[in-house]
């Protein structure tokens, strides 16, 4: 089942998955001035068996001005920097999740991909939070969130993390403070029903990659 909810927003923190559960989809997004090739995949799909997982399909971008040929351009340093600076400063996963069965690693970049990667997570996915530069973490539990299925609805668990604006390099001090409840995330909106068409559409997309499903959104 796909998670049809936004992971919790922690002020002054970013989140990142260290590995992606089978069933996760990654949009084939292209940077400005480029588009997917006409017959190209809509997304990459993490698939696999009990021993090995990998990303199916390849993302390919072509210049918007060019119709038939894919333009192979090496990303400029500032583009590489833009992607790099959005990453968390240091990995902080308690286990090497990428080595877990049923998980895919971060896929390598493709030519002219967009600067932000758009994932569609599945139930059981875990993401890890870290304070952005200039903030330090106060927490009383795991700085992680898991997408769970409860009574037919998906929801993300709340990470126990507060990022305070003190300019210190220590990321995870041993201090405890009461967890602030996140603003703008009312309880009534923390989960939504997953429609019965989810798996059908996901399966069809995995098979063909060509169907236009913008109007049959499964989330």
């Amino acid at each position: 089942e796909l998670c049809d909810d936004d992971p919790p927003e922690i002020p002054h923190a970013t989140f990142k998955a260290m590995a992606y559960k089978e069933g996760t989809m990654l949009n084939c997004e292209c940077k400005r001035g480029f588009r997917r090739i006409k017959s190209g995949s809509l997304y990459m799909l993490c698939t696999g068996n009990s021993s090995h997982s990998s990303w199916d399909n390849q993302c390919q971008c072509t210049s918007s001005a060019t119709r038939n040929t894919t333009k192979q351009v090496t990303p400029q340093p500032e583009e590489q920097k833009e992607r790099k600076t959005t990453e968390m400063q240091s990995p902080m996963q308690p286990v090497d999740q990428a080595s877990l069965p049923g998980h895919c690693r971060e896929p390598p970049p493709w030519e002219n991909e967009a600067t932000e990667r758009i994932y569609h997570f599945v139930v059981g996915q875990m993401v890890y939070y870290q304070c952005v530069q200039g903030y330090r973490a106060l927490h009383r539990g795991p700085a992680e969130s898991v997408c769970k299925m409860t009574h037919g609805k998906t929801r993300w668990t709340q990470p126990q993390l507060i990022c305070t604006g003190e300019m210190e390099t220590s990321q995870f001090p041993g201090e405890e403070k009461p967890q602030a409840s996140p603003e703008g995330r009312p309880e009534s909106e923390t989960s939504c029903l997953v429609t019965t068409t989810d798996f059908q559409i996901q399966t069809e997309m995995a098979a063909t990659m060509e169907t236009s499903i913008f109007t049959t959104e499964y989330q």
């Epitope: 936004d6 809509l42 952005v132």
Partner: nanobody, 130 residues
């Protein structure tokens, strides 16, 4: 790759209500995008009205419309809505729907600056008369 078409604009008396819709189409997934509304009055710059995250968990509004306007989305219909209540003459403008991409690498899921939006609709006129 994403086409956005606004509808629902028109004329309304001050204090009245109007509901704008923005339908998305294209070979992609609607829930990939956060959605926002902007407006531009004659002779003025385009300004942020409000935005909603990919799954509708988070919303943000500009101060002039807080408590009067509400943004919602229906991912099954690939549509985002702007419910305008208690309208004022200063709400008169062309209203634009726009889409932005978001990944967790950025710590604000709702974007408020027009430069952060990648896809735009053509706009729909709203006129509020006193």
């Amino acid at each position: 790759e994403v086409q956005l078409v606004e509808s629902g604009g028109g004329s309304v008396q001050a204090g009245g209500s109007l509901r704008l819709s923005c339908e998305a189409s294209g070979r992609t997934l609607f829930s990939s995008y956060g959605m926002g509304w902007f407006r531009q009055a004659p002779g003025k710059e385009r300004e942020f009205v409000g935005a909603i995250s990919r799954f509708g968990t988070y919303t943000s509004y500009a101060d002039p419309v807080k408590d009067r306007f509400t943004i919602s989305r229906d991912n099954a219909k690939s549509t985002v809505y702007l419910q305008m209540n208690n309208t004022k003459p200063e709400d008169t403008a062309v209203y634009y729907c726009a889409a932005y991409t978001y990944s967790g690498s950025f710590y604000s899921t709702v974007k408020t600056h027009h430069d952060e939006y990648r896809y735009w609709g053509q706009g729909t006129q709203v006129t509020v008369s006193s």
